[in-house]
């Protein structure tokens, strides 16, 4: 799927826009906002009542490099007794992130983005009933 | 893909710090993965530390449309619907990648850029801080 | 320009630890993974992990695993590898080095530490 | 782990000469492979990535070719700096590996 383009009057005129080949993008990897951190409460992976373990995979031709997956840990919830309480469920919660993805063609090394759906926590929900007829 | 491949012992690249500019293959390498959380799954509602969401839009950015999770309560709710204010409801933020068009308005020229979102909401037990 | 320094050489008993430093400059730290190569004498290169900068996150190599730390500070441009309970085995140049964009392979070198491992 | 192993170990030869180093993949690596010159107390410099792109700065006599498990290093005509450790790299998965080095020997 390609980049959807806003509305053409928006944009500047052509000329002062960088010249781009046919069907690529120019993109500056030099990052926004790099120094901003995660501002989350301490170790909520283990002090949620749906907790959760974290897997790293590693690859050497995307970028970032390491993805960070959660995996819940248990099909309940841990209620009160810190007992796993299965009339209710521990679900992932996912995210959509891009990266770049290393190719090579010929000799020109070039990347393609690629959408990546991150799982970032788990939450604890009332399980859906199905009632049979 | 980007420049046209060369042949003999393809040649330099010109820059010292290649790459701070990469050219990108427009088309997007992705399983078609909803944008709309409210369409995938309605945990938000369902869950005991319910969230809402609020759509965050700018054009000059890609993805456009960014959903922010906000947690209804400060406690997390019980069987019987009430709030429990011995638990909390917490967010859980993730940093993703998203490309801003750089310079502005321009169509397919763009700058990586890290964001913090919002995805969602989890209940925990909270710090409890003792004072001497 | 892009320059990779190493800290000096260290001499070290054998079970003790040794932390090498590597300064940054020239480019943007954050954007950049920095490697940690080693080499022993007479032998050739060895991979021993890898750092990101920007989160710390780290990834070894099986046989470094649970003797070596590597750790980075954003505020002087900084990364360090420390090895613990060293043998003569860890004698060896250690390099860090810098990993090109999506990290595969390196492309700029620090100068190289010499760890001499005796008791 | 992917195993990378170079042949010949050692090579004599002359200023002039045409030399080409081979490396082999345990399992294919596409086109992820990167060669290094190392000489005695210096850093290893990197000649070419990705098989066969050149990295700025080197000179053309120096080229790589190949793709999946096998590689080679071709230096077209022998220079007096070229006699150094030639080091073959995987850079398709972690952990990172080299290869065993080729020492490139004045005759």
């Known amino acids: 799927r390609k980049i959807p383009k806003v509305g053409h009057t928006f944009f500047q005129k052509p000329e002062s826009c960088p010249p781009v080949p046919e069907g690529s993008m120019k993109l500056d990897t030099g990052i926004i906002n790099e120094n901003q951190r995660v501002s989350m409460s301490r170790n909520i992976e283990s002090r949620s009542t749906s907790p959760w373990n974290y897997t790293v995979t590693w690859d050497p031709n995307r970028y970032p490099s390491e993805v960070v997956q959660a995996q819940c840990k248990h099909l309940g919830c841990i209620n009160a007794q810190g007992k796993e309480d299965i009339s209710m469920n521990s679900v992932p919660i996912q995210q959509e992130t891009l990266v770049l993805r290393r190719k090579h063609q010929g000799c020109s090394v070039s990347f393609q983005l690629e959408k990546v759906l991150v799982t970032v926590g788990c939450t604890c929900v009332t399980p859906v009933v199905h009632h049979v007829q | 893909g980007i420049a046209i491949p060369r042949n003999s012992g393809c040649p330099n690249s010109e820059d010292k710090n290649f790459p701070r500019t990469v050219m990108v293959n427009l088309n997007i390498h992705n399983r078609n993965t909803s944008t709309n959380p409210k369409r995938s799954s309605d945990y938000y509602n369902r869950s005991t530390s319910p969230w809402n969401l609020h759509r965050n839009e700018d054009p000059e950015r890609y993805p456009s449309v960014i959903w922010e999770a906000k947690c209804r309560h400060l406690g997390c709710v019980k069987a019987d619907g009430n709030v429990d204010y011995h638990m909390n409801s917490v967010p859980i933020q993730q940093e993703i990648l998203v490309l801003r068009r750089e310079p502005r308005h321009c169509p397919n020229s763009f700058r990586l850029e890290k964001i913090l979102v919002s995805v969602g909401c989890t209940c925990v037990t909270p710090i409890v801080h003792h004072v001497a | 320009q892009v320059q990779l320094v190493q800290s000096g050489a260290e001499v070290k008993k054998p079970g003790a630890s040794v932390k090498v430093s590597c300064k940054a400059s020239?480019?943007?730290?954050?954007?950049?993974?920095l490697h940690w190569v080693r080499q022993a004498p007479g032998q050739g290169l060895e991979w021993m992990g890898i750092?990101?900068?920007?989160?710390?996150?780290?990834n070894y190599a099986q046989k470094f695993q649970g003797r070596v730390t590597m750790t980075r500070d954003p505020s002087t441009n900084t990364v360090y590898m420390e090895l613990s309970s060293l043998t003569s085995e860890d004698a060896a140049v250690y390099y860090c080095?810098?990993?090109?964009?999506?990290?595969?392979?390196?492309?700029?070198w620090g100068q190289g530490t010499t760890v001499t491992v005796s008791s | 782990d992917i195993q990378m192993t170079q042949s010949p170990s050692s090579v004599s030869a002359s200023v002039g000469d045409r030399v080409t180093i081979t490396c082999r993949a345990s399992q294919g690596i596409s086109s992820w492979l990167a060669w290094y010159q190392h000489k005695p107390g210096k850093a290893p410099k990197l000649l070419i990535y990705?098989?066969?792109s050149l990295q700025s700065g080197v000179p053309s006599r120096f080229s790589g070719s190949g793709s999946g498990t096998d590689f080679t290093l071709t230096i077209s005509s022998l220079q007096p700096e070229d006699f150094a450790t030639y080091y073959c790299?995987?850079?398709?998965?972690?952990?990172?590996?080299f290869g065993g080095g080729t020492k490139v020997e004045i005759k």
């Open positions: 790299q995987q850079a398709n998965s972690f952990p990172l590996t």
């Open positions: 020239g480019y943007t730290f954050t954007i950049y993974y």
């Open positions: 750092i990101n900068p920007s989160g710390g996150r780290t």
């Open positions: 080095a810098r990993g090109e964009f999506s990290s595969g392979w390196l492309d700029y």
């Open positions: 990705a098989a066969s």
